[in-house]
Amino acid sequence: RGVFRREAHKSEIAHRYNDLGEQHFKGLVLIAFSQYLQKCSYDEHAKLVQEVTDFAKTCVADESAANCDKSLHTLFGDKLCAIPNLRENYGELADCCTKQEPERNECFLQHKDDNPSLPPFERPEAEAMCTSFKENPTTFMGHYLHEVARRHPYFYAPELLYYAEQYNEILTQCCAEADKESCLTPKLDGVKEKALVSSVRQRMKCSSMQKFGERAFKAWAVARLSQTFPNADFAEITKLATDLTKVNKECCHGDLLECADDRAELAKYMCENQATISSKLQTCCDKPLLKKAHCLSEVEHDTMPADLPAIAADFVEDQEVCKNYAEAKDVFLGTFLYEYSRRHPDYSVSLLLRLAKKYEATLEKCCAEANPPACYGTVLAEFQPLVEEPKNLVKTNCDLYEKLGEYGFQNAILVRYTQKAPQVSTPTLVEAARNLGRVGTKCCTLPEDQRLPCVEDYLSAILNRVCLLHEKTPVSEHVTKCCSGSLVERRPCFSALTVDETYVPKEFKAETFTFHSDICTLPEKEKQIKKQTALAELVKHKPKATAEQLKTVMDDFAQFLDTCCKAADKDTCFSTEGPNLVTRCKDALA
């Protein structure tokens, strides 16, 4: 049983407006519109949001007023479909408007673009930012919600409100300081990094819902919640997992008002039932709504009960294993996942789900045999290779990260992944490698028992994005193979890929490796991307180049940039030394 109220309301829009309050209501409607129609300007969306809010207020005043009984999808969809020049700007998305609800809303959802062709969200310089923030904080935050939501159409809406609130607090504090720039930059960079991670994690949840349904998501939630709340009983974990599944399903389905409302309800429930959930919730529960829900979502693991019996007792040694499994498969497997997960906060959720899958497959096979206990008696020992594989991955990669640093580690991953899938576009490979490489900074500095869950669950989320981008234009059989399996098998599948032997190397094009003096003035991040683009292209030209050969070329390239960017006449340096560099590269890779 979930915790959510289910009374019917005469007017859904009035109900949500009352529950959420005007500020959150408007923010969520803006996010919804920005995620559906990603090319519209802030002003266009702000106008629609105001119209929807005014209408909601009339329904609050009189729930029987005209159209107040309409569903939110009908109201929002009618607004979106009334936008002028929809076909010119959005092409076939306009066909959604010929459909009836609920097909129309689901048509909009299917047209969300994970990689919209929008320019990167550039942060204005501090002084300008503070001026516009002081002039109109509401409009300023509206722009933030709009710009993030349209670039991340599956961003978890209530969490985006939280990040906007963080943004607001940072600006309020830093804009009062003498040195605004040095106050703002590190703080806003921190929020940006966290928000980007939040985005890929949520996208993975929606992918799970889209491809495998709430059954798969609920299994993920049971494992995750059991790790965090090892003292809660199975019934409590199941209730929380059911509610968390509902909240996420609503957000992934574009039902953002319901999602935010139900998330607040779930946070309230958790805070009212701390005794049966966890001893670590009080600090979170003392915070206001958005901070409270965010805090609960990443609360530290409760202390594990000291007297937990060995997992084998109920799931291997018990004589009734096959009987219990046959009677209620999902419940029995659920209790296995719960019991195993609460004992292993040091494992990734992906690993726990792989173990549960292995256990299920073993029971399916063994319970049909003449002597089941003899057959499934070794199942826990058979988990060992499944556990060792990600542990080795973490050790190898963290050692490499410690040796090379973040940029060098990204380059090592870029070479590896370009060899695995050389047909993938260079910008996608560079983006993926840069994101995968951040795992070092994010996870390798953590205590030993936190590394594995951090590394593997983060890598899985990044690889999900690789799969989504590849789905749009499939070019690599390697990638297709790994992306078409189950979500939990993706990371091991990608890790196991080797050099693609079917690939015909790209011919060497001098212009790919020709650079100009404008590179010298680029910010460090952009310089890195240019160099990594060249590295990926080198590997595409010579997929079997040795690490040593690539290092020679990249060192030479770095030296060339350094020399020419320090030269008095940069343009001449680039035009004379550039061709020499290209020749040396060709020779080094010959």
């Epitope: 689901e106 349904g213 059954r215």
Partner: nanobody, 125 residues
Framework: EVQLVESGGGLVQAGDSLRLSCAAS????????MGWFRQVPGKEREFVAA????????RYLDSVKGRFTISRDSTKNAVYLQMNSLKPEDTAVYYC??????????????????WGQGTQVTVSS
């Protein structure tokens, strides 16, 4: 495998009613949602209504709202579609479908794993 058997179709006059039934049977039956779709020759299969197994949440195509009612009997693994005030444009083959994992989209036929053979509904004017 899951088997779905529909019944209750037939020929009726505009304004009349019909009740379609669909019974699901088979090994390890996991139902998250059951729905009804319909198809007219030469056209795509169209979502009509669906009901979630746990909460009993329902969704209807706008043009059938207020006329059609979907309900379930979880003890019998059955779903029903009560169709009132039928119109000639409701004429189609009606298919029952099961989603066994609770996928995100209600109206996409790819969200459903198992399908019945279909039952013909004809509404004459």
């Amino acid at each position: 495998e899951v088997q779905l058997v529909e019944s209750g179709g037939g020929l009726v006059q505009a304004g009349d009613s019909l009740r379609l039934s669909c019974a699901a049977s088979g090994r390890s039956l996991g139902i998250y949602r059951m729905g009804w779709f319909r198809q007219v020759p030469g056209k795509e299969r169209e979502f009509v209504a669906a009901i979630s197994w746990s909460g009993g949440t329902t969704r209807y195509l706008d043009s059938v709202k207020g006329r059609f009612t979907i309900s379930r009997d979880s003890t019998k693994n059955a779903v029903y579609l009560q169709m009132n005030s039928l119109k000639p444009e409701d004429t189609a083959v009606y298919y029952c479908a099961v989603d066994s994992s609770g996928r995100l989209y209600w109206t996409l036929s790819t969200s459903y794993d198992y399908w019945g053979q279909g039952t013909q509904v004809t509404v004459s004017s």
